[in-house]
């Protein structure tokens, strides 16, 4: 039969399994919510066509269904900072574009662990930032719809 | 159905300047960037510069960077390149052209206006 | 400054491919536009975002980019397919947009 002492270490690491699992699905959230942003932004702006940001080649990961593959969208932050900076007009501002890449480069690394020795096997189509974010926000979506609620 | 028409070419002393416009009809005027590209008699495509469609971003070309302009007047749904310091080599067809589907291509372009550098 | 460059001319029999590249530095990390020029007339974008075809144009164009060349593919070349083509993209800093040569593609008769 399981002493008590067992079953309280099996239940706390439970608790912290579930805890962990909570803060996984909110930095999910948050990175959803960030690369949403992102696009919608992108979107307004493309369509006031002074359309620099589509020359870009941004590249894609083969495949992505692990957190891990999320080192391909770290992979391509610089280039996005640079879209960014490129740019800024009246029609389309953001205040902070360092820190908002910032932001998404923290909470992919929270997310994916530190790790950088998994390296990201990109496709040979490119896309352009557009197609960028929505591929990595289809990412973010199927897994917070497959994670445990 | 979008017109682009350039005027304000013709032959001009070196050294004089010259206004260059481009009316355009058929399409949100405001809504887009436009770009200024250029071709020498018998020569290739040379871009020129760019605006963007609200005429705060502005980029041009080495070869005249500091003496050219562009701007625009979105009530007027027209472009414009001031052109000072004009040189021999400036000679050319100037094309006014804009981006209007969702690439980055210049889809749509003017019938242009022949600027001619001599003494 | 920033350069693409193309072969100057290109020459195929009616009914051939002809291929006309377009080489440059930043192209692994730039698109890369196509334009045809006939006499006498203004430019017309053909490809767009490397392998992408404006409505319009034929099928018997297309696109394609590898590493620092990008490559204009005309299959089955006629004569109205006779023109200048440019490249088009823009520089490492994304700021200044940049025309190749241009190529002259001549269809022996």
């Known amino acids: 039969a399981p002493t008590s002492s067992s079953t309280s270490s099996s239940t706390a690491e439970a608790q912290q399994q579930q805890q962990q699992q909570q803060q996984q699905q909110q930095h999910l959230e948050q990175l959803l919510m960030d690369l949403q942003e992102l696009l919608s932004r992108m979107e307004n702006y493309r369509n006031l066509k002074l359309p620099r940001m589509l020359t870009f080649k941004f590249y894609l990961p083969k495949q992505a269904t692990e957190l891990k593959d999320l080192q391909c969208l770290e992979d391509e932050l610089g280039p996005l900072r640079h879209v960014l900076d490129l740019t800024q007009s009246k029609s389309f501002q953001l205040e902070d574009a360092e820190n908002f890449i910032s932001n998404i480069r923290v909470t992919v690394v929270k997310l994916k662990g530190s790790d950088n020795t998994f390296e990201c096997q990109f496709d040979d189509e490119s896309a352009t930032v557009v197609d960028f974010l929505r591929r990595w926000i289809a990412f973010c979506q199927s897994i917070i719809s497959t994670s445990p609620q | 159905e979008v017109q682009l028409v350039e005027s304000g070419g013709g032959l001009v002393q070196p050294g004089r300047s010259l206004r260059l416009s481009c009316a355009a009809s058929?399409?949100?005027?405001?809504?887009?960037?436009m770009h200024w590209v250029r071709q020498a008699p018998g020569k290739g495509l040379e871009w020129v510069a760019d605006?963007?469609?609200?005429?705060?971003?502005?980029y041009y070309a080495d070869s005249v960077k500091g003496r050219f302009t562009i701007s625009r007047d979105n009530s007027k749904t027209t472009l414009y390149l001031q052109m000072n310091s004009l040189r021999p080599e400036d000679t050319a067809v100037y094309y006014c052209a804009t981006p209007y589907y969702d690439s980055s291509g210049l889809d749509y372009w003017g019938q242009g206006t022949l600027v001619t550098v001599s003494s | 400054s920033y350069e693409l460059t193309q072969p100057p001319s290109v020459s195929v029999s009616p009914g051939q491919t002809a291929r006309i590249t377009c080489s440059g530095d930043a192209l692994p990390k730039r698109f890369a536009y196509w334009y045809q020029q006939k006499a006498g007339q203004a430019p017309v974008l053909v490809i767009y975002?490397?392998?992408k075809r404006p409505s319009g144009i034929p099928e018997t164009l297309s696109g394609s980019s590898s590493g620092t060349t990008a490559t204009l593919t005309i299959s089955g070349a006629q004569e109205e397919d006779e023109a200048d083509y440019y490249c088009?993209?823009?520089?490492?800093?994304?700021?200044?947009?940049?025309f190749g040569g241009g190529t002259k593609l001549t269809v022996l008769g």
């Open positions: 975002e490397d392998n």
């Open positions: 058929g399409f949100t005027f405001s809504y887009y960037g």
């Open positions: 088009y993209s823009t520089d490492n800093t994304g700021g200044l947009w940049v």
């Open positions: 605006i963007s469609n609200d005429g705060s971003n502005k």
